[in-house]
C-alpha cells in the first residue's frame, strides 16, 4: 500500500457561477476515503493570502482562514467521507470571483484541482401582457441581473425577425447599486403566436415564452447557467 | 458565558425613526451572524435580515428592505437595527439571535430578550 | 415568499415521545433547508435547539432529535418532561432568507 501523501489522488472540480446575495456552492469532489479523521480538504483562492476554508479531523479549522470568508464558508461534512469536498459559500459578493484550488490531502495521497468561479446576478424573466398600452404589448421583467445583459426578442411565427426596432429596453439600478432590475417591452404584437424573451450575460442566459390566444396566455420560463461544468 | 442584551422599550410616535442596539459578550463578535427577527401577537416570528458583523455584508427580507438598516460596531460588539418611517404596523418585539454558519451545523443558538416597540401617535 | 406550516398545539405527557413537524409550501424540506428549531417559553425566554436539520445546539439535552421525515423537517422530543412545555418554532432557509413556521403549542 501506498505510504500516506506519496501517492496523487484523483480531484475533480467542475467551473461554476455565484448569484450575488445568495448561497452558492464551489464544487469539488475526491477519491473516497472512510477515515475522516486522515482527510484535509483546504480551499485557497488566488491573490488571496490566507485560506478560504480548511477542514481536517472531521471539523472545521478556520485559524488561517482569510477574513473576507470568516462566517461564510462550511464544507458539507456529513457527505466528507464519500468523497464531496465541496464548499458551501454564504452570501455570494461579487469580489468572490476568482481562481480557487480544492486542495485534498486523504491517507491515500494528495491532489488537487482549479475552478474558476464567476459572480453576477441572475433572475428568471416573467412576460406578461401589457394592457395598458395603446396597442397590445408584452412587458418582460427580471429583478437582478449583472453585469448588464442584452435583451432580445423572438417569435415563432416570425422566425428571424429583428424586433429591436418595436421593443424598448431599459436597466433599472436596484437599492444596492450592483444589480440592476430589466424590463423590455414589445409592442405591435399579435395573437396565436408565441413570444420568446432572452436575457444574457457572460454568466447565464433566462429565457421566458409567452403565448396568447384568445382564451388564454401560457407562460414558461428557464435559466442556464453559461460555462458551467468540468 | 455568551449573551445578547438588547436595549429598553421604545414608544415612538408615527413617522419616526427608531434605532435599537443588540450588545454581544462571551464570544468572537465577528465569527458569528446577527439575525433580527419581529413577534407580534397572532403574527408568529417573521425574520427581518442579518448583518455579518465587521464586514458590510447584510441580507434583509424584501419586505423590511426599505424599513430596516443594520449596523455593527466591532469595537463595542453591539449590532443595530434602525426602523424608519414608523407606522402601527411596526408596533412588535424585536430580537436579535446569533446564527453559526459552519460545516458541522448551521444553528440560532443565543437570543437577546427583545426590545419592545410600541407606535402611537 | 414561501410559507411554513408547523401544527398548531400538540398534547403530550411526562416520558412520552412527541414529534412536532415543519412543512413547506415549495415541496419537499431539505438539508440546503438548514432546518432550525428554537423554543419560546414565557416572557420572550427563546433557545435554540437543533441547526442544520438534525445538529443539536451545545448544551440542548439529548432528548431533543431533529431529522427529515418524508418530506418534512421533524422535532422529536424522547421522554418529555414538564419543562418542555412551550412554544417551538422551525425555520427554514430559502438560499438568502429565513421562514419561520407559525409555531407549535406543546401542551
Known amino acids: 500500500f501506498g505510504i500516506s501523501g506519496k501517492h496523487f489522488i484523483t480531484v475533480t472540480t467542475f467551473t461554476s457561477a455565484g448569484n450575488i446575495g445568495e448561497d452558492g456552492t464551489l464544487s469539488c469532489t475526491f477519491e473516497p476515503d472512510i477515515k475522516l479523521n486522515g482527510i484535509v480538504i483546504q480551499w485557497l483562492k488566488e491573490g488571496i493570502k490566507g485560506l478560504v476554508h480548511e477542514f481536517k479531523e472531521g471539523k472545521d479549522d478556520l485559524s488561517q482562514q482569510h477574513e473576507m470568508f470568516r462566517g461564510r464558508t462550511a464544507v458539507f461534512a456529513d457527505q466528507v467521507v464519500v468523497g464531496n469536498a465541496s464548499l458551501r459559500l454564504k452570501n455570494v459578493q461579487l469580489t468572490d470571483a476568482g481562481t480557487y484550488t480544492c486542495y485534498i490531502r486523504t491517507s491515500k495521497g494528495k491532489g488537487n484541482a482549479n475552478l474558476e468561479y464567476k459572480t453576477g446576478a441572475f433572475s428568471m424573466p416573467e412576460i406578461n401582457v401589457d394592457y395598458n398600452a395603446s396597442s397590445e404589448s408584452l412587458r418582460c421583467e427580471a429583478p437582478r441581473w449583472f453585469p448588464q445583459p442584452t435583451v432580445a426578442w423572438a417569435s415563432q411565427v416570425d422566425q428571424g425577425a429583428n424586433f429591436s426596432e418595436v421593443s424598448n429596453t431599459s436597466f433599472e439600478l436596484n437599492s444596492e447599486n450592483v444589480t440592476m432590475k430589466v424590463v423590455s417591452v414589445l409592442y405591435n404584437v399579435t395573437i396565436n403566436n408565441t413570444y420568446s424573451c432572452m436575457i444574457e450575460n457572460d454568466i447565464a442566459k433566462a429565457t421566458g415564452d409567452i403565448k396568447v390566444t384568445d382564451s388564454e396566455v401560457k407562460r414558461r420560463s428557464q435559466l442556464q447557467l453559461l460555462n458551467s461544468g468540468p | 458565558q455568551v449573551q445578547l442584551q438588547q436595549s429598553g422599550a421604545e414608544l415612538m410616535k408615527p413617522g419616526a425613526s427608531v434605532k435599537m442596539s443588540c450588545k454581544a459578550t462571551g464570544y468572537t463578535f465577528s465569527s458569528y451572524w446577527i439575525e433580527w427577527v419581529k413577534q407580534r401577537p397572532g403574527h408568529g416570528l417573521e425574520w427581518i435580515g442579518e448583518?455579518?458583523?465587521?464586514?458590510?455584508?447584510?441580507t434583509y427580507n424584501a419586505k423590511f428592505k426599505v424599513k430596516a438598516t443594520f449596523t455593527a460596531d466591532t469595537s463595542s460588539n453591539t449590532a443595530y437595527m434602525q426602523l424608519s418611517s414608523l407606522t402601527s404596523e411596526d408596533s412588535a418585539v424585536y430580537f436579535c439571535?446569533?446564527?453559526?454558519?459552519?460545516?458541522?451545523?448551521?444553528?440560532?443558538?443565543?437570543w437577546g430578550q427583545g426590545t419592545s416597540l410600541t407606535v402611537s401617535s | 415568499q414561501a410559507v411554513v406550516t408547523q401544527e398548531s398545539a400538540l398534547t403530550t405527557s411526562p416520558g412520552d415521545t412527541v414529534t412536532l413537524t415543519c412543512r413547506s409550501s415549495?415541496?419537499?424540506?431539505?438539508?440546503?433547508?438548514?432546518a432550525n428549531w428554537v423554543q419560546e417559553k414565557p416572557d420572550h425566554l427563546f433557545t435554540g435547539l437543533i441547526g442544520?436539520?438534525?445538529n443539536r445546539v451545545p448544551g440542548v439535552p439529548a432528548r431533543f432529535s431533529g431529522s427529515l421525515i418524508g418530506d418534512k423537517a421533524a422535532l422529536t422530543i424522547t421522554g418529555a418532561q414538564t419543562e418542555d412545555e412551550a412554544m417551538y418554532f422551525c425555520?427554514?432557509?430559502?438560499?438568502?432568507?429565513?421562514?419561520f413556521g407559525g409555531g407549535t403549542k406543546l401542551e
Open positions: 415549495t415541496g419537499a424540506v431539505t438539508t440546503s433547508n438548514y
Open positions: 425555520a427554514l432557509w430559502y438560499n438568502n432568507h429565513w421562514v
Open positions: 442544520g436539520t438534525n
Open positions: 439571535a446569533r446564527y453559526y454558519f459552519g460545516s458541522s451545523s448551521f444553528y440560532f443558538d443565543y
Open positions: 448583518i455579518l458583523p465587521g464586514t458590510s455584508i447584510t
